[in-house]
């Protein structure tokens, strides 16, 4: 059973316990359980997105190593972002209370998608240039071929820079996610400690 589903089952079990099982201070306990669920849900969301960013980052590292692999990598990155968005939407649907980071996460996803779009566009230009260059070299029309090669090199350099920037962006996003999870765990631990009998 997926972890979010287990979370919800646990939450339901806690909420639907018989009244006799609850100690004095019912509203406070309910509030505490609500907070615990909220933080648990936020952690789940953070971890899911963290995984997506890490996978994306791995793909980027491989892409940087070989220009020839760019096209396939962009396809895979697109799939990863798409899967990540699906996972995020599924989690949001099952954890409607988790509003805390939605706006920020949306901006992050948009920023990543925007840069990925730039990479895809640069890749298309690069692929077209390579094809034209191959044709020209085959017909031994070297003058224009050299000019074309310089343009190609400039595009390749630009694409490398875009990928470099994207890798940094993804890394920073990952670390911010890690920081959010770390802070939430600390808050959750404090809540548990506060809930323990004296």
């Amino acid at each position: 059973m997926p972890v979010p589903a287990l979370c919800l089952l646990w939450a339901l079990a806690m909420v639907t316990r018989p009244a006799s099982a609850a100690p004095m201070g019912g509203p406070e306990l309910a509030q505490h359980e609500e907070l615990t669920l909220l933080f648990h849900g936020t952690l789940q969301l953070g971890q899911a997105l963290n995984g997506v960013y890490r996978t994306t980052e791995g793909r980027l590292t491989k892409a940087r190593n070989s220009l020839g692999l760019y096209g396939r990598t962009i396809e895979l990155l697109g799939q990863e972002v798409s899967r990540g968005r699906d996972a995020a939407q599924e989690l949001r649907a099952s954890l409607l209370e988790t509003q805390m980071e939605e706006d920020i996460l949306q901006l992050q996803a948009e920023a990543t998608a925007e840069v990925l779009g730039e990479v895809a566009q640069a890749q298309k230009v690069l692929r077209d240039s390579v094809q034209r260059l191959e044709v020209q070299l085959r017909s031994a029309w070297l003058g224009p071929a050299y000019r074309e090669f310089e343009v190609l090199k400039a595009h390749a350099d630009k694409q490398s820079h875009i990928l470099w920037a994207l890798t940094g962006h993804v890394q920073r996003q990952r670390r911010e996610m890690v920081a959010q999870q770390h802070r939430l765990r600390q808050i959750q631990e404090r809540l548990h400690t506060a809930a323990l009998p004296a």
């Epitope: 470099w164 920037a165 940094g168 890394q171 920073r172 670390r175 920081a179 770390h182 802070r183």
Partner: antibody, heavy 120, light 107 residues
Framework: EVQLVESGGGLVQPGGSLRLSCAAS????????MNWVRQAPGKGLEWVSY????????TYADFLKGRFTISRDNAKNSLFLQMNSLRDEDTAVYYC?????????????WGQGTLVTVSS | DIQMTQSPSSLSASVGDRVTITCQAS??????LNWFQQKPGKAPKLLIF???NLETGVPSRFSGSGSGTDFTFTISSLQPEDIATYFC?????????FGQGTKLEIK
């Protein structure tokens, strides 16, 4: 040239407070996450706190127990660490550190440090 | 927290020697590892990031390798100015944690 200059250290009694500052120059401050790291005399390095580039996300080492607060003023290219309820074991050189230009490593450029001594 | 176990804690070598320091993480940290050099009274200086990437301006005699839990830092030919303490540090997860350091001395 990237420069990070810490200030605000000094001698303080146990239970007292100090506010450390880190003045940044030579780079676009609001593009970079920042951290505080400390080093007790003759000891190893210990991470203290993190703040994201926007300042929206902050977190701290567990041992601080809510005594320290990290903040930043992007308009003034400054990072701060408010330290309250100081203890003897907080005696250390405190460094501010910036992430790598490429975004990869979080602790790439360090200031020269400022010494905080907690003693009665 | 992720523990970083660095060895040896101190090391004595001659100029021109090949020097190797190891760092072991208590769990998988991918390649999220820095190596720092620190001289007395100075701030740590980044030498290697992402386990194997040489920081700009750092001499090529310094190198790093490894991934997962086991990492190695190497000075291919020790120079007098390399006398310092060297630290590894992980940034896979918070809190960021450091090895206890390796103090390098000249024989």
């Amino acid at each position: 040239e990237v420069q990070l200059v810490e200030s605000g250290g000094g001698l303080v009694q146990p239970g007292g407070s100090l506010r450390l500052s880190c003045a940044a120059s030579g780079f676009t401050f609001n593009n970079h996450e920042m951290n505080w790291v400390r080093q007790a005399p003759g000891k190893g390095l210990e991470w203290v706190s993190y703040i994201s580039s926007s300042g929206n996300t902050v977190t701290y080492a567990d041992f601080l127990k809510g005594r320290f607060t990290i903040s930043r003023d992007n308009a003034k290219n400054s990072l701060f660490l408010q330290m309250n309820s100081l203890r003897d074991e907080d005696t250390a050189v405190y460094y501010c550190a910036r992430d790598h230009l490429s975004g990869t490593s979080p602790l790439s450029y360090w200031g020269q440090g400022t010494l905080v001594t907690v003693s009665s | 927290d992720i523990q970083m176990t660095q060895s040896p804690s101190s090391l004595s070598a001659s100029v021109g020697d090949r020097v190797t320091i190891t760092c072991q993480a208590s769990q998988d940290i991918n390649n999220y590892l820095n190596w720092f050099q620190q001289k007395p009274g100075k701030a740590p200086k980044l030498l290697i990031f992402d386990a194997s990437n040489l920081e700009t301006g750092v001499p090529s005699r310094f190198s790093g390798s490894g991934s997962g839990t086991d990492f190695t830092f190497t000075i291919s030919s020790l120079q007098p100015e390399d006398i310092a303490t060297y630290f590894c540090q992980q940034y896979e997860n918070l809190p960021y944690t450091f090895g206890q350091g390796t103090k390098l001395e000249i024989k």
